[in-house]
Structure formats: C-alpha cells, structure tokens
Amino acid sequence: AGVFELQIHSFGPGPGPGAPRSPCSARLPCRLFFRVCLKPGLSEEAAESPCALGAALSARGPVYTEQPGAPAPDLPLPDGLLQVPFRDAWPGTFSFIIETWREELGDQIGGPAWSLLARVAGRRRLAAGGPWARDIQRAGAWELRFSYRARCEPPAVGTACTRLCRPRSAPSRCGPGLRPCAPLEDECEAPLVCRAGCSPEHGFCEQPGECRCLEGWTGPLCTVPVSTSSCLSPRGPSSATTGCLVPGPGPCDGNPCANGGSCSETPRSFECTCPRGFYGLRCEVSGVTCADGPCFNGGLCVGGADPDSAYICHCPPGFQGSNCEKRVDRCSLQPCRNGGLCLDLGHALRCRCRAGFAGPRCEHDLDDCAGRACANGGTCVEGGGAHRCSCALGFGGRDCRERADPCAARPCAHGGRCYAHFSGLVCACAPGYMGARCEFPVHPDGASALPAAPPGLRPGDPQRYL
C-alpha cells in the first residue's frame, strides 16, 4: 500500500506564438482545479477499468480575475498535493491523465459552471520510494508543469511497496539475513515469504510462496525481461540463458506501444494498434469510460455505440459540451419577447414580462382595453403593453375620472391670469402682453409682433386658449 502524490507547479501559456486568452475575466471571475486519473501501465485490465489505480480531485484554487489587456499569466493554483492512495503493489509503470478544470463564479443558481481547459496524458516508469520526478506536458497552447512520486505507507517498503518492515526485536541489529529498512533504520525487513529466488526488484508476493512479476518482467522468479518480439527473430546473437535469439535493435523492441497495444514495424518506423479505449501514437492516451464519471453538472453518461466513442454525455438543460462542462447562456438568444427580462435559473429558463404581456416567452399581448372603460367620453388606447385613456377636454387621470383643472399648471405667461372655461382655459393677459398664453409682448407703438389681432379682440383682451 502507498500513495501517489502529484504536485502542480504551474499552469499557464506555453512557449511560442498564439498565447491563449485568459480563462477568467472581470465579468466572469473563475478558479482552477485539477483531476488526476491513474491506471496501471500495461496491465490487461487497464483498458477496461476506470482509473484502476485511483483518482483524485484537487481543492479549488484562489479566485482569479483577468487584468484587462494583460496576457494570460500562470494562473493561481490550489494549495497542497493531489494524493491517490493505492492498496496493492505499486505497478512500476503507470498511465496518467491530468485534467485542468475552470470553475466560473458568476451568480449561478444551478451551481458553478465547469469547463475543461486542458487534458494531458502519458505513461511513465516510476519506482516507489524514489525522488520527485519533474515533468512538463503541453495541451494546445497551455503548459502544465508538475512533479510526482510514489511513496509506500508503513509497514510497506521497496520499489513496489511489497516488502514489509517490522520494529526491531533486539535493539542492536536485525535478525540473520534481514536488513535494516531504509530510511527507517530502527526497523527491520520482515522475513521474506515469497517463493525462494523471487526477484526482490521485479517480483513481489501477497501470499506466502508466490512470485508475482512487476510489469515488464516475466518468468517463475520474475528475472526475465518481457520481449514482445519472437524468439525466432533472425536478428542478434543467441542467448545462452534462454535459448532464444535476443533481438537486435528494431523499432518494435521493448514494445513502444503502451496499454496493451500491439506493435508492427513499418518501413520507416512502427505502428501501434491500440486496444479499445486507448489512442495516440503509442496508445498512451487513456480512453475514459462512463465508470470514470466524465459527465459534469449532472449529465448522464451512456456507453458509445461504436468502439471509437467510449461514452456520450447527455446534458441537463442549460449545459452543453462533450462533458456537459459548458454552461449555455440561453438568455443570449433573447428568448423573451416584447422586452421581457430573461432569467436563466440553471434548471429552467424564465421570462419576467413587462406589463401587458404574458406567456412563457411573453409572447401574448394582453388586450389592455378589454373590460376597461374610459370615463367622461375618453377613449382607450393600447400601447407598449399598457392601457392608457385619451381623455376628453376638461378631464384627466388614468381613467378620465378626474375633472381637469386647466389652470393648475399656470399656463398664462408674464403674469397673465388664468380662468377655467367649459372648453379649456382662458388667459387674461397683463398690459403689454398678448397671445393665447400671453406669450407675446406688445410693441410700445401699438404694433404687435404678431399679425393684427382677429376682429373683435383688442390687445390686452382675454384670449381663449383653444
């Protein structure tokens, strides 16, 4: 038993032209988190089993808001390690997938929106208990820098975490044939229970008397390196120990195809035929199945109909993308008619309608004048979804029920006096002014700035405002 540990050092734009846009903005702040999936390298079950060695999800990083105009920098990362505990022996060779996810932090009723920024994959050979291994992987324009290691959990030790350590029985030294357990010098290796002669480097056992081989090794004592080329290969000298012809250098030697892929030589290089669920030049990219939980935001995972499509995510309303990772801005399609306000609730879309409109998309124009009478001879006018009365002279208010005081607004200029009249208002102008609203001055010589007053009206007479 032990723990695989992954430390993310940086995630940001890779070198070269075409730097990616920052994934966050002032309008949509976001934060990153990471997911790691581990599978044993060449084991037969790897193609089918979901993250058979284990998987882990990081905490979420600090909230990041893009500085306008600035290039995308290395993005702030979550604290701590990603730890994937493993119960059995460490396989020595493993496949990994590391995904970088963005969580948008808008005001989302249906929960945060996730989107996959980058996915890197690879296959590595790693002994447990060794130092941190550093790695750089690129996905599109992004670059991920990370370190990883596998360490055994006491009492297990060794490159596969299969040897056991026990506290010393005597204070001075370990028993006959037993070494101290580095780095736990105060403990001793437990007596070996594996089959006699089982390679301590390449074999391990979980039951007394057995000898199980780590990946890449075979034979009853796990001392024979696995070679995928035939023993009858015409190249190379004969091997005295195995009776086989040891192959000379060839493109398929050592089988460059990961995850159980089969290698065939081509005139210039080699070609890997990958098992279902794996792809890439060396079958190094692991296929994801429904059991890995690839659908986000409540999407339903269904097995793909053809071998090239391991799964399909059916997304809930409001999400899209191959993993349901993208929130659909359904309001950007302006589904609400007649000026209605669009609300995306995550699980549903709602329209808040303006007065006078109704329906799921505010598509129904209510007949505001239906059943509404305008009093005192007023007429009902529909407009903008609101009911309005055009009132007869001398009346006002929403329903023309109020008797209008035409003088309330002080319509007579230059000190003219206002009189209410059955047909409107009349202004009695102060000396020197004339006009319906007393707006025009009378010239001192008696000539008006206007054409001559109509017959029967002298300047200064009250004038009816029609």
């Epitope: 882990a56 999800l57 999407g299 339903l300 995972c301």
Partner: antibody, heavy 119, light 107 residues
Amino acid sequence: EVNLEESGGGLVQPGGSMKLSCVASGFAFSNFWMQWVRQSPEKGLEWVAQIRLKSDNYAAHYAESVKGRFTISRDDSKSSVYLQLNNLRAEDTGTYYCTQGNWVGFAYWGQGTLVTVSA
Amino acid sequence: DIVMTQSQKFMSTTIGDRVSITCKASQNVGTTVAWYQQKPGQSPNLLLYSTSNRFTGVPDRFTGSGSGTDFTLTITNMQSEDLADYFCQQYNNYPLTFGGGTKLEIK
C-alpha cells in the same frame, strides 16, 4: 460492473433515529452525484436527497418532507454515501434505495434496505 | 412541486401487443422526463431519459414521446419479460418527482 449495496435498515419507533449506508463499486465514486430514493405502497417512489461532489462543496438537496430531519453525506475514500434519519415518522416507512445520481435520470440502483417506523 | 400523474394504475395486455403508457405533468417540463421499469421484487431500472432516449441495453421496442406536459412510453411487440411497473419522473426542477406508476398485466 456498477454495484450499490445498502444497509442499516430495520424497525424503529416513531421519533427514533437510524443511519443508512450505501457502499459503491465499479465506478469512480467521487465523480458522481449520489441520491436516496424511497418507495412505499402508499406513496410510491419518492426522491429523498441528493449529494453532489467535493468540488461542489458536497452540496445537498432534500425533499421538503424530510428537510431538517434527514442528512445525506458521503465518504469518497470509502466509496460510500450515508443517510442519517432523525425524528422518524410512520410515513417514513419504506424501502430506501441508493442511486448513482445525476440530473438526467438515475442510472443505477441498489437493492434497497427496508425502514419500518412503528410503535 | 411538479406533480406527475399516471392516470392508469393497471393496464391489461397480451404478448405481441402494442402498449402505450401515459404520464401528465402539472406544468411544462419540456422534455426532461425519464421512464423506469420495476419488476416484482427488484429495484427500478432506467429505461428512457430526455423523453425518448434509450438507456444502455434497453431494447428498441421501448420508445418514448411527448413534450411539455404530456408524455407516452410505448412498448411495441410486448414480451412476457416486460410485465412490470412503469414510472415516469421529471427532472425539470427540484424536488424531483415520480408518477404513481402503471402496472402491466396479462389479460
């Protein structure tokens, strides 16, 4: 193969408590929403509670009839989901199913565990 | 809450028949409806999701249709192994709600 196994049911008096457990295997448990659904002859199938992922801060949702009395939780390291039932009533009687949850239908169900609330 | 109503509690059928089970939602749920089959003494199994999509391994004699408030599960060429209870469920909004179920029986 996906497998869900419930346990913890039994007979309990009104006002009593119990804790249901569900152990999952055959899938990456920590990446899935999980839910409890119950079934009784009187009420048929009834959704009870849902718990989302660590990255959602384990957000939980409940049916109105159990809010404040039932608590859903999960332990990803043990591939397990739990339902703590408090202040039980006669109408809580039924078979409680653990389901591999999501929003678009419940893909996999356990065999169920029977909870009987009776004096 | 959205109420899902399966008006027919029982339906009689014969092998080889075409059977249609209906479900009505109390408000518009779009196409966010799933159907489950439950055989005696077993747990429910997901048949259809998003109204008409068959889940993995479901035979193509099961089809679904409808949108808004009215939904139908149709079994063409009824088989003896299809004798079971059938439930509809909406996932348009919390709380997630099920119909009361329709039991298929042999005439």
